[in-house]
């Protein structure tokens, strides 16, 4: 592809403070978000006749963090094929050689909104449980490939007006160090599990904590643990859930344990008070049962000690969620990750540049040879559990349809996806 690549295939357009140089098939570019990795635009794919999201990774090898994340994202997007994880439709670079190589463009499915926008809506139990079910299916699929996310948050989960949901990114690399006393970076930490905040070991149910935080936010309409930094984040957790047991404290590193044990002791607030009946939908007797189930699920997900927290499988079988259970979605075959050293890779910048370039060239080669599907697949599994047309869940009618696929949008261009302040 690089041999035959010519300037006539591309055109440039100014988007915000960046120049997008994209294939001519992608027209009507419009910025929809910006994140740590770059700017995201909505566009119309004139070949497929669909709207897509085009994400520009500008100099993805500029430092170790960007390089590792870009390489990991490329490899995983190419391997993972599940209806609850965003699909990669195309990858390209306008540069012709490795020496010139500067930018990577990822073309993905375009969704209608991210969960930040859904949080401000009055969701009924049907919609809420279906969104949570899909989140859990996507997470379980990642776990089956050995990918533990650790950084799920509303800005990186996108939905369509028919209530279908997809996870946008792959979270923190296994090698990403998270230190309790670390300098606070400008990232959203509200959804990170105690074991991540406290620099402990972690297992798959680290992601259940994040789902619990997101569910709590969908119910309350505001962030449930809104700390200003790691330390304050921990304070917000214990103020509401109570100081954890001595058994939990024993699992902490000495310096962290010393800090945690010297915090004021909190008894914790009952879940009936944290999530009272009146904040849930309550239009029928059935809603009262569902409210009780929802609160029970929250109480099992928002458990500080990971050894006592519900697992993904258990959550999928919970009465609040299990009504949607479909083995084709919840037990989809695991993706085959072709880079066995993906999480452990350490390279100099010049090597990262080469690895990322190879991944892009590999995609271009495969698509040139017709290996890559020339249409968006509806993922590896078909949905038997999608609610019937008669169900009101098929339309989140009041949703803002400002299209979005802004991964890691802690600073979004769209005001409606900005930080959440007061509760409704």
């Amino acid at each position: 592809m690089s041999d035959s690549k010519c300037d006539s295939q591309f055109y440039s357009v100014q988007v915000a403070d960046s120049t997008f140089t994209v294939l001519k098939r992608y027209q009507q570019l419009k910025p929809i978000g910006s994140g740590a990795q770059g700017i995201v635009c909505a566009a119309f794919d004139t070949v497929l006749g669909i709207n897509v999201a085009v994400k520009k990774l500008s100099r993805p090898f500029q430092n170790q963090t960007h390089a590792k994340r870009a390489y990991r994202e490329l490899v995983l997007l190419k391997c993972v094929n599940h209806k609850n994880i965003i699909s990669l439709l195309n990858v390209f670079t306008p540069q012709k050689t490795l020496e010139e190589f500067q930018d990577v463009y990822l073309v993905m499915e375009l969704m209608d909104a991210n969960l930040c926008q859904v949080i401000h809506m009055e969701l009924d139990h049907e919609r809420m449980s279906y969104l949570l079910y899909q989140m859990l299916c996507g997470i379980k699929h990642l776990h089956s490939a050995g990918i533990i996310h650790r950084d799920l948050k509303p800005s990186n989960i996108v939905v369509k007006s028919d209530c279908t949901l997809k996870i946008l990114d792959f979270g923190l690399a296994r090698t990403a160090c998270t230190n309790f006393m670390m300098t606070p970076y400008v990232v959203t930490r509200y959804y990170r599990a105690p074991e991540v905040i406290l620099g402990m070991g972690y297992k798959e149910n680290v992601d259940i904590w994040s789902v619990g935080c997101i569910m709590g936010e969908l119910v309350k309409g505001c962030v449930i643990f809104q700390g200003t930094d790691h330390i304050d984040q921990w304070n917000k957790v214990i103020e509401q859930l109570g100081t954890p047991s001595a058994e939990f404290m024993k699992k902490l590193q000495p310096t962290v344990r010393n800090y945690v044990e010297n915090r004021p002791k909190y008894p914790g607030i009952k879940f009936e008070e944290l999530f009272p009946d009146w904040i849930f939908p309550s239009e029928s007797e059935r809603d009262k049962i569902k409210t009780s189930q929802a609160r029970d699920l929250l109480s099992k997900m928002l458990v500080i000690d990971p050894d006592k927290r519900i697992s993904v499988d258990e959550a999928l079988r919970h009465p609040y969620i299990t009504v949607w259970y479909d083995p084709a979605e919840a037990e989809a075959p695991p993706p085959q990750i072709y880079d066995a050293q993906l999480e452990e890779r350490e390279h100099a910048i010049e090597e990262w540049k080469e690895l990322i370039y190879k991944e892009v060239m590999d995609w271009e080669e495969r698509s040139k040879n017709g290996v890559v599907k020339d249409q968006p697949s509806d993922a590896a599994v078909s949905s038997n559990a999608t609610p019937s047309q008669s169900s009101s869940i098929n339309d989140i009618s009041s949703m803002s349809t400002e299209q979005t696929l802004a991964s890691d949008t802690d600073s979004s261009l769209d005001a409606s996806t900005g930080p959440l302040e007061g509760c409704r």
Partner: antibody
Framework: EVQLLESGGGLVQPGGSLRLSCAAS????????MSWVRQAPGKGLEWVSA????????YYADSVKGRFTISRDNSKNTLYLQMNSLRAEDTAVYYC??????????WGQGTLVTVSS | DIQMTQSPSSLSASVGDRVTITCRAS??????LNWYQQKPGKAPKLLIY???SLQSGVPSRFSGSGSGTDFTLTISSLQPEDFATYYC?????????FGQGTKLEIK
């Protein structure tokens, strides 16, 4: 055993050129990146340039950009540094070094480059 | 460019002493920090990589710690062969940069 042997250093006039070579042995040369690091007399270490395993990706310190060119011949297990428009401040011992992961784990013994009229 | 600042620039100590050298980066470099030892007329030698990992063959009295912007090299009990100049280096982004060095001398 990893061995890196630099050659090509010497005395050159300002504005002149010099080509340094580094013969590598004891490891699969084409596998990883290589760097040049220099040390002016009595001073600290200064990274000069790096090149990826295939030779397609190169990086330079601002102080040498446009004047120095790093290259490699994987069939000969040799790393090169072409130095043009040399200046007095380029006087230093030049070390060839092997990149391993994100660090430099083996260094040659160095070759002295003196730029003086 | 990321600036690396070492302190102290020189240090006098005795055999058996515990010695600490610090290195500060002008911006966060995660754990992408390496420590090198150099003796007069010799090439540098890698001691610690990734902030805290000991290079094979290096005595266990050498240890490294830190993350983000502040890093430390510690020699738990100085030996005669440890008197040398020590450099930190970041490998987080190009241009890769070194600290100015810390000369460790016999008291």
């Amino acid at each position: 055993e990893v061995q890196l042997l630099e050659s090509g250093g010497g005395l050159v006039q300002p504005g002149g050129s010099l080509r340094l070579s580094c013969a590598a042995s004891g490891f699969t040369f084409s596998y990883g990146s290589m760097s040049w690091v220099r040390q002016a007399p009595g001073k600290g270490l200064e990274w000069v340039s790096a090149i990826s395993g295939s030779g397609g990706s190169t990086y330079y310190a601002d102080s040498v950009k446009g004047r120095f060119t790093i290259s490699r011949d994987n069939s000969k297990n040799t790393l090169y540094l072409q130095m043009n428009s040399l200046r007095a401040e380029d006087t230093a011992v030049y070390y060839c070094a092997r990149g391993h992961g994100s660090n430099i784990d083996y260094w040659g013994q160095g070759t002295l480059v003196t730029v003086s009229s | 460019d990321i600036q690396m600042t070492q302190s102290p620039s020189s240090l006098s100590a005795s055999v058996g002493d515990r010695v600490t050298i610090t290195c500060r980066a002008s911006q966060s470099i995660s754990s992408y920090l390496n420590w090198y030892q150099q003796k007069p007329g010799k090439a540098p030698k890698l001691l610690i990589y990734a902030a805290s990992s000991l290079q094979s063959g290096v005595p266990s009295r050498f240890s490294g710690s830190g993350s983000g912007t502040d890093f430390t090299l510690t020699i738990s009990s100085l030996q005669p062969e440890d008197f040398a100049t020590y450099y930190c280096q970041q490998s987080y982004s190009t241009p890769y940069t070194f600290g100015q060095g810390t000369k460790l001398e016999i008291k």
